[in-house]
């Protein structure tokens, strides 16, 4: 409970205070008063910074003082040895003594009394906007003539709102204009004209002087015009900064003048008048207006007639003209009706390509189809540009209404293969170096993607499993990685008719025509890790010469493992067929002479021990296209070999291009048009 005065004595006063004491007193006087605290006796053990024993005076979070030692009064007429004056109504006194006292100390005696504070002068922040009146225990604010005190009981303002102007012409000014306008006020004026007229406000630059904006550009005092959902302003500064003629497009206008506590200027004066609401001379395409006028206003009527080849497609179908009236809101009636050109509609989407959402689908507009580069290109030409024709179709100059076709780009790896030395004697590779590489997991083998629906592989890979599971897009063949890659499902396996099927494939000595095609159930989506390899051309340019280099890749046996976990690759040269014949077969299943060598086979390898091996079968022997050095084609397929790390035999793909093309054409899915 607050009190007006009180006494505070140290423990046992006037006897010696005990050791190890901590005591605090919370002084509180009524609100609106300050506290005068004074000590009449002080005898506390002296120490540096009063570290041992002390009496501490705290106001809020501030330490007003910390006392120790002996004090006596400087004034023989006053017993006060130390005093404190605070302008707040709460104070805390804390007395502390440590564990020992060298002598006997008697402590302190202190008294407090409530003192009046002058809220009008004692604080940095002045509490009233205008006049401040102090009284004992408080204060009140008051205002000059014609001002009133706001609900906060601190700020004064003038009452300048409520005026409604309905006349078609008038003048409005800020309070006291041209004398300084009142501070801390909000003046609202309303102009309300009959419908069909818009308020037009005119100002002269010199009739406007309002406190300027702050450094951030925010108006301290401001004039704002609000017409429906449109706002003009806020405006401030010396000279009107806005347009001197404001067409509000509305019959109702609110004028709001807001001022702050400081910086009064002369204010502003404006004129307004009502104009018949104009309706814009709309540029309605493909039509003629009658009568033709420079300006149309409220209640004007026009006939809008469509040009030849256009019609009003909303409302009465087939109409060639309609009437429109300038309405009170400044809008034309029947404004939804238009002479519209033919609409070709949203263009059809295409597989593996896109068409930008057209700005317009109307007659004469142009769209462009593009393929998803760099993985697809436009096969059937025409440049992809189509225009909306008069018959309502999108038409291309070359293809007519036929849509473009995006087909995979072949033979271009996203990242070129760089040999890093470590397939047998080869290097680690990334699937982006060989995006055509297909993994078969039973038997463990390879293949080459040649388009969206077809995989090329060796016949001996698929002869024992006509429903192989294949994967693309993964460098690693760990189960965890394959689970996240693309699995290909076969629809049918086509083995070359020249491949001899055996009862016991393990004893095979004839690998002639070791080639097969796998037709996929679903098309493969191409990307950086999945894209096809090209097929060889039929010209003599694609005849391989001894020494020509090719790339092989796969997850077959390496020097370190029976199966590679990550893709391996090697660059090896084409060699004469006799080099392959001369190598002794490592684990012969028959007499060495029984092994068949034919012109359908390519011999390659023999350099630095680089070779394909068990598990690489069916993968491509990729050679740079002689007519386009950016591309690779499948010159061969890993087929068989006498001994890993020497020379290997590859199916010569060029000899089978006709069979490949024929098989694919005869078994392609007809396009759904």
């Amino acid at each position: 409970e607050p009190t007006m005065y009180g006494e505070i004595l140290s423990p046992n006063y006037p006897q010696a205070y005990p050791s190890e004491v901590e005591k605090s007193w919370d002084i509180e006087v009524p609100e609106g008063y300050g506290i005068h605290l004074y000590f009449t006796h002080l005898d506390i053990e002296l120490s540096e910074n009063c570290a041992y024993d002390s009496v501490q005076i705290i106001s809020g979070d501030t330490e007003e003082g910390r006392l120790c030692g002996q004090r006596s009064s400087n004034n023989p007429h006053s017993p006060i040895v130390e005093e404190f004056q605070v302008p707040y109504n709460k104070l805390q006194v804390i007395f502390k003594s440590d564990f020992s006292n060298e002598e006997r100390f008697t402590g302190f005696a202190a008294y407090y009394v409530a003192t009046d504070i002058n809220e009008c002068t004692d604080f940095v922040d002045v509490p009233c906007s205008h006049f401040c009146n102090n009284f004992i225990g408080g204060y009140f604010c008051s205002c000059p003539p014609e001002y009133f005190l706001h609900d906060d009981m601190k700020n004064c303002g003038v009452n300048c709102s409520g005026d409604v102007f309905t006349a078609l012409i008038g003048e409005i000014a800020s309070p006291n204009y041209p004398k300084p306008y009142p501070e801390n006020s909000r003046c609202e004026y309303q102009i309300r004209l009959e419908k069909g007229f818009q308020v037009v406000v005119t100002l002269r630059r010199e009739d406007f002087d309002v406190e300027a904006a702050d450094s951030a550009g925010n108006c301290l005092d401001s004039l704002v015009f609000v017409a429906g959902d449109r706002q003009f302003g806020p405006y401030c500064g010396h000279g009107f900064p806005g347009p001197l003629n404001i067409e509000t497009k509305s019959n109702a206008l609110d004028i709001i003048f807001q001022t702050d506590l400081t910086g009064q200027k002369k204010g502003w004066k404006l004129r307004y008048h009502g104009d018949p609401m104009p309706c814009p001379k709309e540029d309605t395409p493909n039509s003629v207006w009658e009568p033709a006028k420079a300006k149309y206003v409220f209640r004007d009527v026009v006939q809008i007639t469509c040009l030849d080849g256009f019609e009003v497609v909303e409302g009465r179908v087939g109409a060639t003209s309609f009437y429109s009236t300038c309405q009170s809101n400044g809008k034309w009636s029947n404004s939804k009706l238009k002479c519209q050109p033919v609409d070709c509609g949203i263009p059809e989407s295409i597989e593996n390509g896109k068409v930008e959402d057209p700005e317009s689908t109307l007659f004469g507009s142009v769209i462009r189809y593009t393929c998803e580069e760099p993985y697809y290109y436009m096969e059937n030409g025409g440049g992809g540009e189509y225009h909306c024709a008069g018959n309502g179709s999108w038409v291309n100059e070359v293809l007519g209404p036929e849509l473009p076709k995006c087909v995979p780009v072949c033979g271009v790896p996203r990242e070129p293969f760089e040999e890093k030395q470590r397939i047998i004697g080869g290097s680690d590779a990334d699937i982006k170096n060989f995006p055509w590489q297909v993994f078969f997991d039973n038997p463990w083998a390879g293949g080459a993607l040649i388009n969206e629906y077809w995989v090329l592989t060796a016949a001996h890979v698929v002869e024992g499993n006509r429903e192989p599971t294949m994967y693309v897009g993964s460098t690693s063949v760990q189960t965890s990685r394959l689970a996240k890659s693309k699995m290909l499902t076969p629809e049918h396996v086509f083995i070359h008719p020249g491949w001899k099927l055996l009862e016991v494939p393990e004893g095979r000595t004839n690998f002639d025509n070791d080639i097969a095609l796998v037709r996929l159930k679903d098309p493969v989506k191409m990307g950086p890790t999945v894209s096809p390899i090209c097929l060889p051309g039929t010209s003599s340019d694609y005849n391989l010469m001894d020494g020509d280099l090719g790339l092989i890749s796969g997850w077959g046996r390496t020097e370190k493992r029976d199966r590679a976990v990550r893709l391996k690759a090697a660059r090896l040269p084409v060699a004469p067929l006799r080099k392959c014949k001369e190598v002794k077969v490592e684990k012969p299943t028959a007499d060495a002479e029984a092994y068949v060598f034919t012109p359908n086979m390519i011999c390659a390898g023999g350099e630095k021990g680089m070779d394909s091996c068990k598990g690489d079968s069916g993968g491509a022997f990729a050679v740079q296209d002689p007519n386009d050095k950016t591309k690779f084609y499948a010159a061969g397929l890993v087929s068989w070999g006498p001994q890993c790390g020497t020379y290997g035999l590859y199916t010569r793909v060029k000899n089978y291009v006709d069979w490949i093309m024929k098989t694919m054409q005869e078994n392609s899915t007809p396009r759904e048009d």
Epitope: D441, W444, T479, S480
Partner: antibody, heavy 125, light 107 residues
Framework: QVQLVESGGGVVRPGGSLRLSCAAS????????MSWVRQAPGKGLEWVSG????????GYADSVKGRFTISRDNAKNSLYLQMNSLRAEDTALYYC??????????????????WGKGTTVTVSS | DIQMTQSPSSLSASVGDRVTITCRAS??????LGWYQQKPGKAPKRLIY???NLQSGVPSRFSGSGSGTEFTLTISSLQPEDFATYYC?????????FGGGTKVEIK
């Protein structure tokens, strides 16, 4: 370098529980299956349990089925073995080991190519 | 469960000797077999996987052979560091099972 470190072993009374952990480093943990193998004092090796790369498939030796649970937290590169209803015959040195699984539909297993140093479990009253 | 019978359970040999250890499966396990070496106080180490494939970093004196039910680990010329216990492991089906072990000691 590739490393497996087991922890969590200790002395426990029959019927009690223990949870072993195996912290993996130096390889992509979630590409590999993992196994627990134990070796009783002076005895041979016994496979206890295994789990595949994503934790969806587990296996147990008959001697621990229903009492032990194998699990993994790929985010923490950690393998666990929760052992409940422990018996005296579960006293052993417990190793964790790495398993490799290749192939997408047909699997090719390469078990226990890397081993930890082991953690000792003693079940005694 | 598939039982793996390893023989002999122990053998004494000299440095330079050719040593053969056999593992017999109670049923056919194709070539799903590995061989492990364990030295006292150490964790086992894989020597051979898939019956005949040498683990990278393992000396070529170690070799594995066999398929189906009969498997062999051969050390062509025993070295001082080869004295240890050897285990076979079948992983054809769960539960995986180890052989009882063969301890190779110095004669």
């Amino acid at each position: 370098q590739v490393q497996l470190v087991e922890s969590g072993g200790g002395v426990v009374r029959p019927g009690g529980s223990l949870r072993l952990s195996c912290a993996a480093s130096g390889f992509t943990f979630d590409d590999y299956g993992m196994s627990w193998v134990r070796q009783a004092p002076g005895k041979g090796l016994e496979w206890v349990s295994g789990i595949n790369w994503e934790g969806g498939s587990t296996g147990y030796a008959d001697s621990v089925k229903g009492r032990f649970t194998i699990s993994r937290d790929n985010a923490k590169n950690s393998l666990y073995l929760q052992m409940n209803s422990l018996r005296a015959e579960d006293t052993a040195l417990y190793y964790c080991a790495r398993d490799e699984q290749l192939g997408g539909q047909t699997y090719y297993y390469y078990y226990m190519d890397v081993w930890g140093k082991g953690t000792t479990v003693t079940v005694s009253s | 469960d598939i039982q793996m019978t390893q023989s002999p359970s122990s053998l004494s040999a000299s440095v330079g000797d050719r040593v053969t250890i056999t593992c017999r499966a109670s049923q056919g396990i194709r070539n799903d077999l590995g061989w492990y070496q364990q030295k006292p106080g150490k964790a086992p180490k894989r020597l051979i996987y898939t019956a005949s494939n040498l683990q990278s970093g393992v000396p070529s004196r170690f070799s594995g052979s066999g398929s189906g039910t009969e498997f062999t680990l051969t050390i062509s010329s025993l070295q001082p560091e080869d004295f240890a216990t050897y285990y076979c492991l079948q992983y054809n089906q769960v539960p995986l099972t180890f052989g009882g072990g063969t301890k190779v000691e110095i004669k």
